[in-house]
Each structure stands twice: as structure tokens, then as C-alpha cells.
């Protein structure tokens, strides 16, 4: 029987019809249209773009397209009182000042409303003091400074290079170390690929380029003033002192020309080893303070940014399902950008636009998906995933009952080497099967499948002949859907060769130089990688919304659960004596994983055999698949992180961008040898094993025969 009862197009051609309708030329046009002026969250320009997208989605044929607005806390520089950093002499005179803006790229000299580089949500302040270089400001970097090098950051201004971890984690670590200010900079070692020219002649970061970004530690809270609830017209707002996740010390980003001026004077200790040295012609001394003749000079920060409650707008489009309208498959990506958003987010927004157009074309020809598809253009992602989180908070009861899947659609490219996918294990087989049907856009793989080029260029570390698929972390709009609500989620984009390009992200990330021309000239002139990403994202949405049986394989969850249990056990076994002393056992977890594996296997057998023409049984089996991800949610959340509720995955406590498996156990074990009360610490490990084992067992039971 057809998976597409609601169509008048030949069923087997539906997916093909959808994919064939996607055009690289359209994506290119949309990208151009979305990147001519800045679309900063909370600005009139971004509101106008929201209305334009609403109008175009209606034209494309969606059933309804609405704006959903919220009043959330945002952060902006003071237009008349710019932020900068100085070197001051013993008399307090400023003998060097960092630049106030990035030199605009060619063709954009007369564009107004380019926000100067700033760290969003930095408090105001003018701290002055000695500088300490803290490498990437990771947890291990501060351990190295404090425990090994005996360098105290208390009362110091720290300078950290961007990369490796989310900037908010860097600031949190600096605060915990007692720093009174943070300077973030882009080192050429991380943001300048060898052999490539800087923009506008290539895709590398020029010395005056600066990465903007928020420095919050929201842990999934959304709007800092309304955690857990939508920031609507009748919202009760916390006072700023009680706001979630705001930094307590001034923070400011700079480029590597300015960083050179600060770092070249550094004294104190030499760097501990080569991993602390970047590519500038400076010694990378750690400090504290400047060397020799400069030892009386200090660094002073001048930060005057303000936090303001501002209206933001999501665009929500609906394509009603013909058979199961109460089951939602969501495709969402953000619209707001720091400046032009050439890659982030508009390379993603342009792809979503073309996917909507293709679905709309099919709908105009009389087709409908089996399930409802929701399309979202999120606002204020750059300020902490605010638009998506507020909408999910407002609609949480519907989403937790009806949400089948969420596919994220931020930047379509961060390179042009191969595909990169992060998703729930439930989607592994969907991704594998889909990419086997798509053509590879890669040179040297003409006539080959995307699966083949992806597997060749990015092989799985565990399974030969399969591609690498990573864990979901955070730092993007899937967070609330996956980590808080337990809706199966995935993301896909084209990426760089991580083996040869060791820089973090892409060099021009969040700078003024992230333009349409950057993409059109250097990354994807033919827009073939954008088209491939559109096919992957769109194809996933199509299958999730249209297949009779949901394309989820619970057996893949069983495989990873065993792998994650083995991993966390081996971490714990680094402390064999303590495990013995405190009677720490992982037996319950391994037993639960074994049960899950057996029950998942039996469920998969039943899934092959059941009568798909019986709508009640079909719905029952699909509900078991849909609710499996939900079953991994602990309503109490993780310790001190109530909005991270997924027991199997959470953003790493040390890097929001990275996913951690069995995060409750992992965090309980982390640095356990330094805990003042070992008995209490190992008690918490035991509690977390109990929570994990119970959750896995409970999830397994949702797959058992219902009676």
C-alpha cells in the first residue's frame, strides 16, 4: 500500500518529485536576498525580513504562516560610548587602544547598522589589572594554570583565544578562577588556514576581523528573565540580578592585530608546552603581567553595553498532514545574524526557503504529507537560542504529545569537504538510507552516492564501511526540542576536512566578512553543496512526515547505549580502589542496557510483521517509536541544569557545543579525586548510575508489547 494516501502524484515518485524540485539557483538567489543588510535580532531590519519570509511562505503554498513574538532580554553596545581595551601606563594614560570596528568589506562601506564587535550580555565595567594568558580558557587550561603552574588568576584580566569550546564556557571558567575581565581573541593558528588568503582575497580571517557572540551560560533556559515559561505579554520577569546565565565580569572580543599588541608584552612564565602557542610572533608567555620595561603598564577594559528587553519574531509555517495532522515533523533554522550572515544563518535559511518552496509546489499539485510539517524561522538564536526556546516553552504540551522529529537548519556549510551529521541514534538508518539515494557533489565522486563519498572522507571510528555520525550537543536551535523535550532530532551540513584544517569553526565566523561573496566566490560557487544539504535536510523531513512506519530504528539506540555504558565504566575504573571502598557497581546499568537490547530486537521483529493496514495498530507502533526519545527524559533534569533533561545526552558541562553521553554519571565522576568529601562524591556517582539504569530500563519497557 502507498505511503502517500493523500496524494494524486504517483506515490513512488513523491520523494523524487520533491528532491527534483530543489534548485541550486534558487538557493543562491535566496541567499543573496537574505544577506544584503544586517539582520540583528531585535532590529527593524530583522522584523521586516520575518514579514517577507511570512509572505513568501504563504505564496509558496503553506496552509498558514504566523509570526510568534516574544519580549526577551537582548544585549547591544552603546552607540555613543564604544567598547574598547587599552594598555595604560603608570600615570593611567592610554598608550594603546584596540579598534572600535572591523574595516568593512569591499562594497559594504556605506551599509549602516553594522554592530561593532562585542560580547553579548557582558556587564558594564572598566576593570584594570595585569594580564594572564589562559590559552583556550578550557577547564583543563585553568587546571594547568592553577594546579600545575601555580598561577592565580584572581583579580587579573585574562586573555583567551577563541576555539575548541563555546565562548560562554570560557567566561564561566574565568569567573570561577576569580578573573575580573576577559579578552577573547582569534589566533591565526585557529582562524587562518595555511596557504589561503584573507578576505576579500580568500576565506581567511584578516587581522582586523573579530568574532562576535553571546557569552551566556543558560543551560537551556531560554530568555534569562523567564526560564521555563514563554516571554509573552503577561510574563513575570525576574530582576536582572536573578536572571539566568548572565556573566558577572566584563568581556570583549578582539582580532589578532590587536591581540598581538597585548601578547607581545607578556612576561611571567613561559607557556607550559607547544599546545599553548598560537601562530602570532609572540612568546605566548602566560604572565601574570607584562615583561621588563613594560611591567608597570596595565590593561584596562572599557565596556558600556546594555541589556534590554526587546521584541523578537519567529515565523511559523504549517503544512497540514492528510492522515495524521496531530503528528508534527519540524524543520527549523534561525534568521537573525550578527551582521550579514553569509554563512550563519542565511546559508541555512536559504535552504529552508527552497525546501518550503518545493513542498509548496507539491501541495499546489494536490499532494499532502501524511503528517503535519512545521517550518520555523527562529529569531534571536545568536542571543542564546531564544526564539526557538520561547516558542517551545509556549507550545510544550503540544510538542511533547505530538512532536515526531525536529530537523535543524542553521548554516548549510562550514566547509566544502564532506557531509557532517549529528543526530539521535533513532535516525542513523534514515540518514544512511537517504544518503545512499543521493548523488555526491564531491569532485572525484561523480556518479557515486553521497553515502560513498561521506564514508570515504569521514569514516566511522567504530564501524568500517559506515560514515561518522556524531552526538548532538548544543549551541543551536535543536536544543530545547532534544535536550528538554526529548523529541528525536538531527542536523546536517557540509564541513571542512578536520584532519588537515585544525582551525575552529570557519575563519570568518560571526565577523563582518561573512558575506554573500564569501560563499559565492570561495565556498560554493555552483551552490552544489547547498543543494546537497537541502536534499539531506529536506529528504529527512519528507521521510519523517510521509513514511507509513516512522523511519526510526530502536536497535541503533541499543548499540550506542552499550558503547556509552562501556565508556563511562572505563572512566570510573580509573579509580578501582574507591569503587571497591564505596561499593560502586555498574551492574544495574549494564543489565538495563541488556534488557533494552533484547526488547528493542523483539520490537523490531514485530515492526516487520504487523498489519500495516490496521490504522490502530499502526498508530500504536508509531507512537512507541515516537515516544522512545521522550522516555529518556528525566522530569527532574540533570543536577543544577533543570532544562537539560535527557539522561543519555547533554551538552558537555565544559563545552556547550559538544555532546556528552550519560552526562549525569560523567559529571559526578569528573575531577572526583579533588573533591573534599570523597564519600559524598562517590555517593553521587552511585545515585547517577541508579538514575541512568532506571531510565534505560523504563525506556526499554515502552517498547515492550503493550499487553
Amino acid at each position: 500500500k502507498s505511503s502517500n494516501e493523500a496524494t494524486n502524484i504517483t506515490p513512488k515518485h513523491n520523494m523524487k518529485a520533491f528532491l527534483d524540485e530543489l534548485k541550486a539557483e534558487n538557493i543562491k538567489k535566496f541567499l543573496y536576498n537574505f544577506t544584503q543588510i544586517p539582520h540583528l535580532a531585535g532590529t527593524e531590519q530583522n522584523f521586516q525580513l520575518a514579514k517577507q519570509i511570512q509572505s513568501q511562505w504563504k505564496e509558496f503554498g503553506l496552509d498558514s504562516v504566523e509570526l510568534a513574538h516574544y519580549d526577551v532580554l537582548l544585549s547591544y553596545p552603546n552607540k555613543t560610548h564604544p567598547n574598547y581595551i587599552s594598555i595604560i601606563n603608570e600615570d593611567g594614560n592610554e598608550i594603546f587602544n584596540t579598534s572600535l570596528f572591523e574595516p568593512p568589506p569591499p562594497g559594504y562601506e556605506n551599509v549602516s547598522d553594522i554592530v561593532p564587535p562585542f560580547s553579548a550580555f557582558s556587564p558594564q565595567g572598566m576593570p584594570e589589572g595585569d594580564l594572564v594568558y589562559v590559552n583556550y580558557a578550557r577547564t583543563e587550561d585553568f587546571f594547568k594554570l592553577e594546579r600545575d603552574m601555580k598561577i592565580n588568576c584572581s583579580g587579573k584580566i585574562v586573555i583567551a583565544r577563541y576555539g575548541k569550546v563555546f565562548r560562554g564556557n570560557k567566561v564561566k571558567n574565568a569567573q570561577l578562577a576569580g578573573a575580573k575581565g576577559v579578552i577573547l581573541y582569534s589566533d591565526p593558528a585557529d582562524y587562518f588556514a595555511p596557504g589561503v588568503k584573507s578576505y576579500p582575497d580568500g576565506w581567511n580571517l584578516p587581522g582586523g576581523g573579530v568574532q562576535r557572540g553571546n557569552i551566556l551560560n543558560l543551560n537551556g533556559a531560554g530568555d534569562p528573565l523567564t526560564p521555563g515559561y514563554p516571554a509573552n505579554e503577561y510574563a513575570y520577569r525576574r530582576g536582572i540580578a536573578e536572571a539566568v546565565g548572565l556573566p558577572s565580569i566584563p568581556v570583549h572580543p578582539i582580532g589578532y592585530y590587536d591581540a598581538q599588541k597585548l601578547l607581545e608584552k607578556m612576561g611571567g612564565s613561559a607557556p607550559p608546552d607547544s599546545s599553548w602557542r598560537g601562530s602570532l610572533k609572540v612568546p605566548y608567555n602566560v604572565g601574570p603581567g607584562f615583561t621588563g620595561n613594560f611591567s608597570t603598564q596595565k590593561v584596562k577594559m572599557h565596556i558600556h553595553s546594555t541589556n534590554e528587553v526587546t521584541r523578537i519574531y519567529n515565523v511559523i509555517g504549517t503544512l497540514r498532514g492528510a492522515v495524521e495532522p496531530d503528528r508534527y515533523v519540524i524543520l527549523g533554522g534561525h534568521r537573525d545574524s550578527w551582521v550579514f550572515g553569509g554563512i550563519d544563518p542565511q546559508s541555512g535559511a536559504a535552504v529552508v526557503h527552497e525546501i518550503v518552496r518545493s513542498f509548496g509546489t507539491l501541495k499546489k499539485e494536490g499532494w499532502r504529507p501524511r503528517r503535519t510539517i512545521l517550518f520555523a524561522s527562529w529569531d534571536a538564536e545568536e542571543f542564546g537560542l531564544l526564539g526557538s526556546t520561547e516558542w517551545a516553552e509556549e507550545n510544550s504540551r503540544l510538542l511533547q504529545e505530538r512532536g515526531v522529529a525536529y530537523i535543524n537548519a542553521d548554516s548549510s556549510i562550514e566547509g566544502n569537504y564532506t557531509l557532517r551529521v549529528d543526530c539521535t541514534p533513532l535516525m542513523y538508518s534514515l540518514v544512511h538510507n537517504l544518503t545512499k539515494e543521493l548523488k555526491s557533489p564531491d569532485e572525484g565522486f561523480e556518479g557515486k552516492s553521497l553515502y560513498e563519498s561521506w564514508t570515504k572522507k569521514s569514516p566511522s571510528p567504530e564501524f568500517s564501511g559506515m560514515p561518522r555520525i556524531s552526538k548532538l550537543g548544543s549551541g543551536n536551535d535543536f536544543e530545547v526540542f532534544f535536550q528538554r523535550l526529548g523529541i528525536a532530532s538531527g542536523r546536517a551540513r557540509y564541513t571542512k576536512n578536520w584532519e588537515t584544517n585544525k582551525f575552529s569553526g570557519y575563519p570568518l565566523y560571526h565577523s563582518v566578512y561573512e558575506t554573500y561573496e564569501l560563499v559565492e566566490k570561495f565556498y560554493d560557487p555552483m551552490f552544489k553543496y547547498h543543494l546537497t544539504v537541502a536534499q539531506v535536510r529536506g529528504g529527512m523531513v519528507f521521510e519523517l512526515a510521509n513514511s507509513i512506519v516512522l523511519p526510526f530504528d530502536c536497535r541503533d539506540y541499543a548499540v550506542v547505549l552499550r558503547k556509552y555504558a562501556d565508556k563511562i565504566y572505563s572512566i570510573s575504573m580509573k579509580h578501582p580502589q574507591e569503587m571497591k571502598t564505596y561499593s560502586v557497581s555498574f551492574d544495574s546499568l549494564f543489565s538495563a542496557v541488556k534488557n533494552f537490547t533484547e526488547i528493542a530486537s523483539k520490537f523490531s521483529e514485530r515492526l516487520q510483521d504487523f498489519d500495516k493496514s490496521n490504522p490502530i495498530v499502526l498508530r500504536m507502533m508509531n507512537d512507541q517509536l515516537m515516544f522512545l526519545e521522550r522516555a529518556f527524559i528525566d522530569p527532574l533534569g540533570l543536577p543544577d541544569r533543570p532544562f537539560y533533561r535527557h539522561v543519555i545526552y547533554a551538552p558537555s558541562s565544559h563545552n556547550k557545543y559538544a555532546g556528552e553521553s550519560f552526562p549525569g554519571i560523567y559529571d559526578a565522576l569528573f575531577d572526583i579525586e579533588s573533591k573534599v568529601d570523597p564519600s559524598k562524591a562517590w555517593g553521587e556517582v552511585k545515585r547517577q548510575i541508579y538514575v541512568a539504569a532506571f531510565t534505560v530500563q523504563a525506556a526499554a519497557e515502552t517498547l515492550s508489547e503493550v499487553a
Partner: antibody, heavy 115, light 107 residues
Framework: EVQLVQSGAEVKKPGASVKVSCKTS????????IHWVRQAPGQSLEWMGN????????TYNQKFQGRVTITVDKSTSTAYMELSSLRSEDTAVYYC????????WGQGTLVTVSS | DIVMTQSPDSLAVSLGERATLSCRAS??????VDWYQQKPDQSPKLLIY???TRHTGVPDRFTGSGSGTDFTLTISSLQAEDVAVYFC?????????FGAGTKVEIK
């Protein structure tokens, strides 16, 4: 109690290589820099290089560049120093030390280079 | 390379008396200087780091001072167990370098 236990004395011919091990215990191995230092008979101390056990980042004394290789095995909390193309003037006691400030030292390994 | 020059080469001090050891760097090293004690046929031991901070368990008769290029290790009241060679080291720049040592004996 922090302990660094080095491998035993070695006698090598000129041109050969020597690999000295340093097994650590009593602290978190990845937390402290491991340095290698040598002391020729009746002489001062000479720093050879160091390693960050957490990520394998190394820095070498240019004097030994190309001849010295410092590695770690995290699974056994052991550091290694290999010196190649040995000559008679490499005869010395070789020490490993843990901590940026050489907080804890191994007992030393005498390497004799003689034809 | 930064050269660390220690003086005197050797020093004989009566028990209970003060011993003052000097270390001079060939260029400014801030306070990135350690002092070590090495007794005959033993490994060196860390005494002082960051020019003036005593390492855990080091008796308070040992005091370090100085910054820039001139550094001093003072033993306020020499004990018999303090007979050793004392080395300074700079860690302001690579390669990390040691002084030639000062031998302290009982007069």
C-alpha cells in the same frame, strides 16, 4: 604520596638510542607537566624538554631538537624520553620531574655512553 | 638563551648563621624563578617557586626574594641538613635554564 619511578641504568654505544621510562603514581597524571632534565657528572642541571600528558603537547630544548622525543602512555601513567644518536658527552643522570616547577623528581637513571 | 649566574660557587656558613645565595639572570625574567636543593647522591628538591613562594613542607628558614634580574635565596639559620648544592632556574622563556649551583657547607 607522589612517586616517580624511573627505569634502570643503561650502557649504550655511540650512535645508539636510549629510552628511559618514568612511571608516576599518587596524583592525576594528566594534571602535571612532565619535564626531562639531565645532569652530567659533577655538573649543573640541563633541561631537555617537557610534555603535557593531557594532550601530548611538547617543547624541546633546541640543543636536543631532532634527537630527543618525549612521549606519554596515559593508560599506565608513564612518561618516556628517547635520546638518539648518542655520543660520549651524553653520559649523565637523566631525571624526570612532574609539575611545571619540577615539584616532584624521579630517582634518576644513569646512562653511560661508551665504546 | 637566558644565562643564570649563581654566586658564590660555594659558601661555608656556621650552624645557626645566615646563608645568602645569589642568582642573576642575563635578562629580565620577572619573578619566574625557582630554587632547588640537591643533596649528595639524591635528586633535586623544589624549595621556592615564583621567586618567593615556599613549596609545601619547606621550612620557613628558607626565603626567596627578587624580581627582574636579581634573585636571592636566604637560609636564615643554617642547619646541618641544609648542606647541599642549591640551583636556581628561570622559566620565563625557553629553553628553561639552570644556574651552575652554589655549594653550601658548614664552617
Amino acid at each position: 604520596e607522589v612517586q616517580l619511578v624511573q627505569s634502570g641504568a643503561e650502557v649504550k654505544k655511540p650512535g645508539a638510542s636510549v629510552k628511559v621510562s618514568c612511571k608516576t603514581s599518587g596524583y592525576t597524571f594528566t594534571e602535571y607537566t612532565i619535564h626531562w632534565v639531565r645532569q652530567a657528572p659533577g655538573q649543573s642541571l640541563e633541561w631537555m624538554g617537557n610534555i603535557n600528558p593531557n594532550n601530548g603537547g611538547t617543547t624541546y630544548n633546541q640543543k636536543f631538537q631532532g634527537r630527543v622525543t618525549i612521549t606519554v602512555d596515559k593508560s599506565t601513567s608513564t612518561a618516556y624520553m628517547e635520546l638518539s644518536s648518542l655520543r660520549s658527552e651524553d653520559t649523565a643522570v637523566y631525571y624526570c620531574a612532574a609539575g611545571w616547577n619540577f615539584d616532584y623528581w624521579g630517582q634518576g637513571t644513569l646512562v653511560t655512553v661508551s665504546s | 638563551d637566558i644565562v643564570m649566574t649563581q654566586s658564590p660557587d660555594s659558601l661555608a656558613v656556621s650552624l645557626g648563621e645566615r646563608a645568602t645565595l645569589s642568582c642573576r639572570a642575563s635578562q629580565d625574567v620577572g619573578t619566574a624563578v625557582d630554587w632547588y636543593q640537591q643533596k649528595p647522591d639524591q635528586s633535586p628538591k623544589l624549595l621556592i617557586y615564583w621567586a618567593s613562594t615556599r613549596h609545601t613542607g619547606v621550612p620557613d628558614r628558607f626565603t626567596g626574594s627578587g624580581s627582574g634580574t636579581d634573585f636571592t635565596l636566604t637560609i636564615s639559620s643554617l642547619q646541618a641538613e641544609d648542606v647541599a648544592v642549591y640551583f636556581c632556574r628561570q622559566y620565563n622563556s625557553y629553553p628553561l635554564t639552570f644556574g651552575a649551583g652554589t655549594k653550601v657547607e658548614i664552617k
